[in-house]
């Protein structure tokens, strides 16, 4: 008789999940020599241990602590780029500006980027059929808790001027319910962080509005100011030109506003 299996609302574990995590770990240590002390088999075992045989709606940050410990990494605290709803451009930016880091440029972020995973209570099986959806099922699922944990730690590590890239094409440029709005903003340390600088990325070619005056940006400024952190905001009117000028700052067209 086939065993009854919980049907969740979200997509199941990404195919080849164990192999992908292990391969990503090895790749990361190959291209980041400073992380070659990491034992990728132990990393996978700790990752697996965080969610295997556990109810996928009952995962805690504590479950991920062994993995967090193994993935401990020092990034320059004044070179952190946060992002919200504009991941691709943020990653393109740190690809060019090699001394800046998004969460996905760290080992743990790189391992889990774009993956889904969950297990089942009391069995060692990975559930490839379905996993809990944050809204429809539960928030304490393996993926959400992982990102909450690593995002909190990443924000806590930041210092001096912290940058955040925000999507100016969305109705809520700053969304209190995003990982940035609900986790990272509240875990920046006022005694270490002097300024949060928002870069609002414009989508439309002819969009010359000052999106730094958007009500949600004003809301972000208010939250940040109340935490005794200064706030500044810049419009990036031409993201394509912005990237090009990061690549080639000596280009004559890069002195004008981007």
């Amino acid at each position: 008789v086939p065993r009854w299996r919980q049907q969740w609302s979200g997509p199941g574990t990404t195919k080849r999940f164990p192999e992908t995590v292990l391969a990503r770990c090895v790749k990361y240590t190959e291209i980041h020599p400073e992380m070659r002390h990491v034992d990728c088999q132990s990393v996978w075992d700790a990752f697996k241990g965080a969610f295997i045989s556990k109810h996928p709606c009952n995962i805690t940050e504590e479950d991920y602590q062994p993995l967090m410990k193994l993935g401990t990494q020092t990034v320059p605290c004044n070179k952190i780029l946060l992002w919200s709803r504009i991941k691709d451009l943020a990653h393109q930016f740190t690809q060019v500006q090699r001394d800046m880091f998004t969460l996905e440029d760290t080992l743990l972020g790189y391992l889990a980027d774009d993956l889904t995973w969950c297990g089942e209570f009391n069995t060692s099986k990975i559930n490839y059929q379905s996993c809990p959806d944050w809204r429809k099922d539960c928030s304490n699922n393996p993926v959400s808790v992982f990102w909450k944990t690593v995002s909190r730690r990443f924000a806590e590590a930041a210092c001096d001027v912290v940058h955040v890239m925000l999507n100016g094409s969305r109705s809520k440029i700053f969304d209190k319910n995003s990982t940035f709005g609900s986790v990272e903003v509240h875990n920046l340390q006022p005694e270490k962080v002097q300024t949060l600088e928002a870069w609002v990325i414009h989508g439309g070619r002819e969009d010359s509005r000052d999106l730094c005056q958007d009500p949600t940006i004003k809301e972000l400024e208010s939250i940040i100011s109340k935490r005794n952190i200064q706030f500044s905001c810049k419009n990036i009117y031409r993201p394509d030109k912005f990237l090009q000028c990061v690549k080639n700052p000596e280009d004559s067209s890069c002195t004008s506003e981007i």
Epitope: A23, K27, T29, P33, R36, H37, H91
Partner: antibody, heavy 123, light 112 residues
């Protein structure tokens, strides 16, 4: 069996560009970093850069940052190198290469190499 | 960048004798994980390079036990015991401790 099959020889005019390919087989293409190495005629080996085919992220040796562009097509398991603004200095054999994994650790040595593609720059 | 300097061989080497190729790095290649990121390759005439040794002293898969690697943090030796005709070519050392990986200029082995 791991194989890296490179495209055939190319002749490029000074100032033009060439794009050469490296088709991978015998393993999951996105699971490994691909490196490129240059060997000028009768000379030694120079590392150009790497690409992570899964993410498309790249890194280059300083001297090749404006010369080489690495890309990858995951649907065909093929890595590419494009060389721009060709000069006689670019006449060389170009290799793609990959490390071996030894019990979940990258060996740090290029265990698998393509057969090389000779690029000749001539007017 | 780390500079790799290779020594020359007294050429040609008599068949059946041992040959030692030396390589020096401008800084230590010993990683905090205990591994030394020094590789040796052989490039036979008209062929792609072949990995012989990685981590200073570990033979790559399928490589004859006539090849052995040794050394310290900055001074390395590749020893070929009982040189054979198929060993002819150019030997390169390479560091992979940090980016960019750098190669020595190569040491040519010829057989008498």
């Amino acid at each position: 069996e791991v194989q890296l099959q490179q495209s055939g020889p190319e002749v490029g005019r000074p100032g033009s560009s060439v794009k050469i390919s490296c088709k991978a087989s015998g393993y999951i293409f996105t699971d490994y970093i691909m490196h490129w190495v240059k060997q000028s005629p009768g000379q030694g080996l120079e590392w150009i850069g790497w690409i992570d085919p899964e993410y498309g992220s790249t890194d280059y040796a300083e001297k090749f940052k404006k010369k080489a562009t690495l890309t990858a097509d995951t649907s065909s398991s093929t890595a590419y190198i494009q060389l721009s603004s060709l000069t006689s200095e670019d006449t060389a054999t170009y290799f793609c290469a990959r490390v071996a994994i030894i019990t979940t650790v990258a060996s740090g040595g290029f265990a698998y190499w393509g057969q090389g593609t000779l690029v000749t720059v001539s007017s | 960048d780390i500079v790799m300097t290779q020594g020359a061989l007294p050429n040609p080497v008599p068949s059946g004798e041992s040959a030692s190729i030396t390589c020096q790095s401008s800084e230590s290649l010993l990683h905090s994980n205990g591994k030394t990121y020094l590789n040796w390759y052989l490039q036979r005439p008209g062929q792609s390079p072949q990995l012989l040794i990685y981590w200073m002293s570990t033979r790559a898969a399928g490589v004859s036990d006539r090849f052995s690697g040794s050394g310290s943090g900055t001074d390395f030796t590749l020893t070929i015991s009982g040189v054979e005709a198929e060993d002819v070519g150019v030997y390169y050392c390479q560091q992979f401790l940090e980016y960019p990986p750098t190669f020595g200029s190569g040491t040519k082995l010829e057989i008498k």
